[in-house]
């Protein structure tokens, strides 16, 4: 931009150098050149000379008018045509910006990833503002009434060291820019309720050579949380439909899950966990791909026996990703043998 220009006069903007997108804007140029009575005053936007809606107000001043200015940024400067000068003479320049006041931040969520030492808060910022917009995260102890504030652009990580005086907090986000200010709804947070267990990882899988081959998936986590509830989802790489298995886990040892799967097929597995009874899930683990072995016996594969899992009193359900472009929109399969269970938080979907 043209922020450090030496002006021989002045340039000013009405309603201001930062204004709401779509407003009518007047930009004034006033020359204060020595030894020059300008024949003409010219306006340039982003280096291009403007031709229309220019008014000469008096000998020293001209104005350009824009109807419904809608560019986020522009670099304006004006020049004078001085008699006897071959080139135009620079008078002044200004950066101008248009944008929107911020929306109220929505979907405020705060979590503590186990072992991270931070509380991470995220929110939806709403529609683009096109101008510099800051977010002030307010964290107020419900026990001591003390309030801390943190500046952020899109999310914030707050050290749990600074949250030692209390377990219960009120959190809200204030969005601020030159055109306005909005507050999110307040979120009640109990630090013990927002911990997400340390990442779960599928380490390996093997398919046995039994008469009815079974696939055993091994997976683990370094979590210290005792009561953990997990989901494992799996599907063939050619399929849109995930089957989801739910179970309680105890990570003092490596977890083993048994599956009876279609032979000679490539499967994708992912797992995620949460502290039992709590709200926040881990993101799905990295996709783990496993190829089941070819069928050796004469037994015919019966598709209705898929997808059964060798773990009693647990739920298997199926969810279908509607399209690869919208991985978070899930559609339940209407098969009577399955209880619907949406696999949300689906950031790592495979086609």
């Amino acid at each position: 931009g043209i922020t450090s220009i030496n002006c021989s006069g002045d340039m000013w903007v009405e309603p201001g150098e930062i204004f709401q997108m779509g407003m009518n804007v007047s930009i004034y140029c006033q020359e204060a050149l020595k030894h020059c009575r300008p024949r003409n005053l010219y306006f340039y936007k982003n280096g291009f000379k403007e031709e229309f809606d220019i008014t000469r107000i008096n000998r020293t001043t001209a104005r350009i008018w824009y109807k419904g200015f809608s560019e986020p940024h522009a670099y304006m400067h004006c020049t004078a045509e001085c008699p006897g000068h071959f080139q135009e003479t620079l008078i002044c320049g200004k950066d101008i910006s248009s944008g929107h006041p911020p929306d109220a931040p929505s979907n405020l969520t705060c979590v503590i990833y186990e072992y991270s030492g931070n509380m991470t808060c995220t929110w939806n910022t709403g529609k683009p503002t096109y101008i510099d917009t800051k977010y002030i995260v307010h964290v107020k102890s419900l026990e001591t009434e003390e309030e801390q504030q943190y500046l952020a652009s899109s999310y914030v990580k707050i050290s749990t060291d600074s949250l030692q005086g209390s377990r219960k907090y009120l959190v809200w986000v204030q969005a601020v820019n030159s055109l306005g200010m909005e507050n999110s709804q307040q979120l009640h947070v109990h630090l013990d309720d927002i911990v997400i267990p340390s990442a779960s990882i599928i380490s390996r899988a093997e398919t046995t050579n039994d008469t009815v081959p079974k696939t055993i998936v091994y997976w683990k986590s370094k979590t210290m949380i005792e009561k953990v509830f997990c989901e494992m989802r799996y599907k063939t790489t050619t399929n849109q439909t995930w089957s989801v298995k739910e179970f309680d886990a105890n990570f003092t040892y490596v977890q083993q899950s048994e599956f009876y799967l279609e032979p000679d097929s490539k499967y994708v597995f992912q797992v995620r966990c949460q502290e039992t009874g709590k709200r926040n899930w881990q993101p799905w683990s990295s996709p783990f791909v496993h190829q089941t072995s070819q069928e050796t016996g004469k037994r015919n594969w019966q598709p209705w026996s898929s997808p059964f899992v060798h773990q009693t009193s647990q739920t298997v359900s199926q969810v279908t990703a509607k399209s690869s472009h919208e991985p978070q929109k899930m559609e339940m399969l209407s098969a009577t043998i399955f209880r619907g269970h949406p696999a949300s938080g689906n950031h790592q979907d495979i086609g």
Epitope: I136, E147, Q148, Q149, Y150, L151, A152, S162, Q174, V176, M181
Partner: nanobody
Amino acid sequence: QVQLQESGGGLVQPGGSLRLSCAASGFTFRLSAMRWVRQAPGKGFEWVSGIDSRGSTIYADSVKGRFTISKDNAKNTLYLQLNSLKTEDTAMYYCAQGVYGDTYSGSQGTQVTVSS
């Protein structure tokens, strides 16, 4: 209780510089966000700049690129460096707790006068 004491104001020519200080006590300064506000003669309070406990900063458009806010947790002191001063910066300057807002907590302030 919370106590804030501003200093460093004075008379300066346009284009000149000043450094304002705000000595704080009565609260945990290192965990506190702070701000500067000002009041020009005959006008209301105007928020100038803010800083959070980790040193992230925010400025009013009118001072962006000219003023710099900072804090020294070891000295429990908030600063505002004023450069390229203009006559319209003439005001009483106050520090307060919190990043943002055009109110202040009743400290005495420090006068900045920009005049040729």
